[in-house]
């Protein structure tokens, strides 16, 4: 038993042109989280096979809001390690899938929205108890940097976590043939139950007397490294009968082939034979098929009938990217006309129209006056989505149905008396005042503050407001 630990160091734009847009915006702040899936062995497994070694989900990272105009930086990450416990022996070789997820925190209908930003996969050899291994993987324009290790949980020890430790029986030393259990120096290895001589580093057993080899090793005691190079190579055959021991450094040393590819030496360099689903000089390119469902958000996968043919994704509205993994801010295109409010619901775009406008994009100006009559000779005026009546003199209200009392507002100044008249109002001014609203005092010398009175009207006469 033990734990696989994954430490994410950074997730951000990779080198080169075509830097991705930040996945978060001021309108849609978001945070990242990660998922890791582990499968044993380098053998090609069906893509839909479960995470047989285990899976783990990280905590959510800090909320991030894009700075307008700034390129996407490395995004803030969740704290802590992703830990995947394993119950049985550590297989020594494993496949991993690491997914970077975005949780959008904007006004989402039905809570936060999740979308997959990037998915990387690889196959690696790793001994338990070893140091942290560092790795960089790219997914489209994104780059993920991380470290990983496998460690045994006491009492298990060894590169496969199959050897057991037990407390010392004597205070000074372990029994014959048994070593102290590093790092638990106060404990000793339990007696081995494997076949005598079975390599403690490269072999393990689950039944007494057996010796099963970790991938990459062979022989009855798992002491012979498997080499894919021919034993009749120029450097000569090995004396071993169960495998090929290559004495000098060769181009296949350290196996440059990724994702479980096998290396063969060529006169000038090496050649990788890639497992199904991978290709490229070092098997570094994943040949995903449409049946694997590589298009996110319901995208249509075209081509990619077999691993050697590329696929393309035809994205649903509102998504883009080579795998439809990026949400388009469709409202940034301002599709709603006439001041309508844009709502991107993910599966649809909606415009909430201002009064007086309609249509999917608020493109229709409603005829506010259609079927609306203004009474008593009023005329209908369209505007701002609400019909309005311009009423004839003496009438008011929304539809000009109310008889207006022009004197209600006490329009005559200085104690003038107001009389309603069919065409408006008339002010009868108090002595000493004149004007349509009795607003001007008559001067003592007989001159008025107004210009000469119009013909036919004497100062002080009731002034009719025309």
């Amino acid at each position: 038993a033990g734990v696989f630990e994954l430490q994410i160091h950074s997730f951000g734009p990779g080198p080169g042109p075509g830097a991705p847009r930040s996945p978060c915006s001021a309108r849609l702040p978001c945070r990242l989280f990660f998922r890791v899936c582990l499968k044993p062995g380098l053998s090609e497994e069906a893509a839909e096979s479960p995470c047989a070694l285990g899976a783990a989900l990280s905590a959510r990272g800090p909320v991030y809001t894009e700075q307008p105009g700034a390129p996407a930086p490395d995004l803030p990450l969740p704290d802590g390690l992703l830990q995947v416990p394993f119950r049985d022996a550590w297989p020594g070789t494993f496949s991993f899938i690491i997914e970077t997820w975005r949780e959008e925190l904007g006004d989402q209908i039905g809570g936060p929205a999740w979308s997959l930003l990037a998915r990387v996969a690889g196959r690696r050899r790793l001994a338990a108890g070893g140091p942290w291994a560092r790795d960089i993987q790219r997914a489209g324009a994104w780059e993920l940097r991380f470290s990983y290790r496998a460690r045994c949980e006491p009492p298990a020890v060894g590169t496969a976590c199959t050897r057991l430790c037990r407390p010392r029986s004597a205070p000074s030393r372990c029994g014959p043939g048994l070593r102290p259990c590093a790092p638990l120096e106060d404990e000793c290895e339990a007696p081995l139950v494997c076949r005598a001589g079975c390599s403690p580093e490269h072999g393990f057993c689950e039944q007494p007397g057996e010796c099963r080899c970790l991938e990459g090793w062979t022989g009855p005691l798992c002491t012979v490294p498997v080499s894919t190079s021919s034993c009749l190579s120029p450097r000569g055959p090995s004396s071993a009968t169960t495998g090929c021991l290559v004495p000098g450094p060769g181009p296949c040393d350290g196996n440059p082939c990724a994702n479980g590819g096998s290396c063969s030496e060529t006169p000038r360099s090496f050649e990788c034979t890639c497992p199904r689903g991978f290709y490229g000089l070092r098997c570094e390119v994943s040949g995903v098929t449409c049946a694997d469902g590589p298009c996110f958000n319901g995208g249509l996968c075209v081509g990619g009938a077999d691993p050697d043919s590329a696929y393309i994704c035809h994205c649903p509205p509102g998504f883009q990217g080579s795998n439809c993994e990026k949400r388009v801010d469709r409202c940034s295109l301002q599709p709603c006309r006439n001041g309508g409010l844009c709502l991107d619901l993910g599966h649809a775009l909606r415009c909430r129209c201002r009064a007086g406008f309609a249509g999917p994009r608020c493109e229709h100006d409603l005829d506010d006056c259609a079927g609306r009559a203004c009474a008593n000779g009023g005329t209908c005026v369209e505007g701002g989505g609400a019909h309005r009546c311009s009423c004839a003199l003496g009438f008011g209200g929304r539809d000009c149905r109310e008889r207006a009392d022009p004197c209600a507002a006490r329009p005559c100044a200085h104690g003038g008396r107001c009389y309603a008249h069919f065409s408006g109002l008339v002010c009868a001014c108090a002595p000493g005042y004149m004007g349509a609203r009795c607003e001007f005092p008559v001067h003592p010398d007989g001159a008025s503050a107004l210009p000469a009175a119009p013909p036919g009207l004497r100062p002080g006469d009731p002034q009719r407001y025309l």
Partner: antibody, heavy 117, light 107 residues
Framework: EVQLVESGGGLVKPGGSLRLSCAAS????????MNWVRQAPGKGLEWVGQ??????????HYAESVKGRFTISREDSKNTVYLQMNSLKTEDTAVYYC????????WGQGTTVTVSS | NIQMTQSPSSLSASVGDRVTITCKAS??????VSWYQQKPGKSPKLLIY???NRYTGVPSRFSGSGSGTDFTLTISSLQPEDFATYYC?????????FGGGTKVEIK
């Protein structure tokens, strides 16, 4: 080869219930949105509903005509999507197909549901 | 919901004929239109996506065109296996909606 196989159709009385299943093979099922689309006798195609992925909290969407009566669920471990139909009406009589994705790229062969008294 | 109106509802043609089916959307759907073929007793098959792109394995005699509200499916030279019902569907706005279908029969 991609295969979607529907089952569970049959004759049911109005107001009754039925549960359809769609078993997928040849695809990484857990990566696909799944839909149900129906076709009434001699009529066109009508989208019924959709279920999305685990990473999307298995979000579901339904046509107005079935909202509140039909429920879609999925079991990724069994590569199967289900359509639970309650309070069935005569107008629900149709061949029901399961399809994948947003654009309905893969289709099953269909299962017939007849609602009649 | 967006309405898709297909015409004609049926047509008779001979092998080798050029056949054109039209579909009209009740509002702008961009190029988010697909065409499906359905043979009697079988499930529909995707032919064209994105208004004009042939899906994997679809013969080149099938072509699609149009954008906005008016779309066309053309079969350049009708083959015996093409006698079927054809449906257009819009995927611009959720929910997806289909036309009423066009039945292509042997003359």
């Amino acid at each position: 080869e991609v295969q979607l196989v529907e089952s569970g159709g049959g004759l049911v009385k109005p107001g009754g219930s039925l549960r359809l299943s769609c078993a997928a093979s040849g695809i990484t099922f857990s990566n696909f949105w799944m839909n149900w689309v129906r076709q009434a006798p001699g009529k066109g195609l009508e989208w019924v509903g959709q279920i999305r992925l685990k990473s999307e909290d298995y979000a579901t969407h339904y046509a107005e005509s079935v909202k509140g009566r039909f429920t879609i669920s999925r079991e990724d471990s069994k590569n199967t999507v289900y359509l639970q139909m309650n309070s069935l009406k005569t107008e629900d009589t149709a061949v029901y197909y399961c399809t994948t994705g947003y654009y309905f790229d893969y289709w099953g062969q269909g299962t017939t549901v007849t609602v009649s008294s | 919901n967006i309405q898709m109106t297909q015409s004609p509802s049926s047509l008779s043609a001979s092998v080798g004929d050029r056949v054109t089916i039209t579909c009209k959307a009740s509002e702008n759907v961009g190029t988010y239109v697909s065409w499906y073929q359905q043979k009697p007793g079988k499930s529909p098959k995707l032919l064209i996506y994105g208004a004009s792109n042939r899906y994997t394995g679809v013969p080149s005699r099938f072509s699609g065109s149009g954008s906005g509200t008016d779309f066309t499916l053309t079969i350049s030279s009708l083959q015996p296996e093409d006698f079927a019902t054809y449906y257009c569907g819009q995927f611009y706005s959720f929910p997806s909606t289909f036309g009423g279908g066009t039945k292509v029969e042997i003359k």
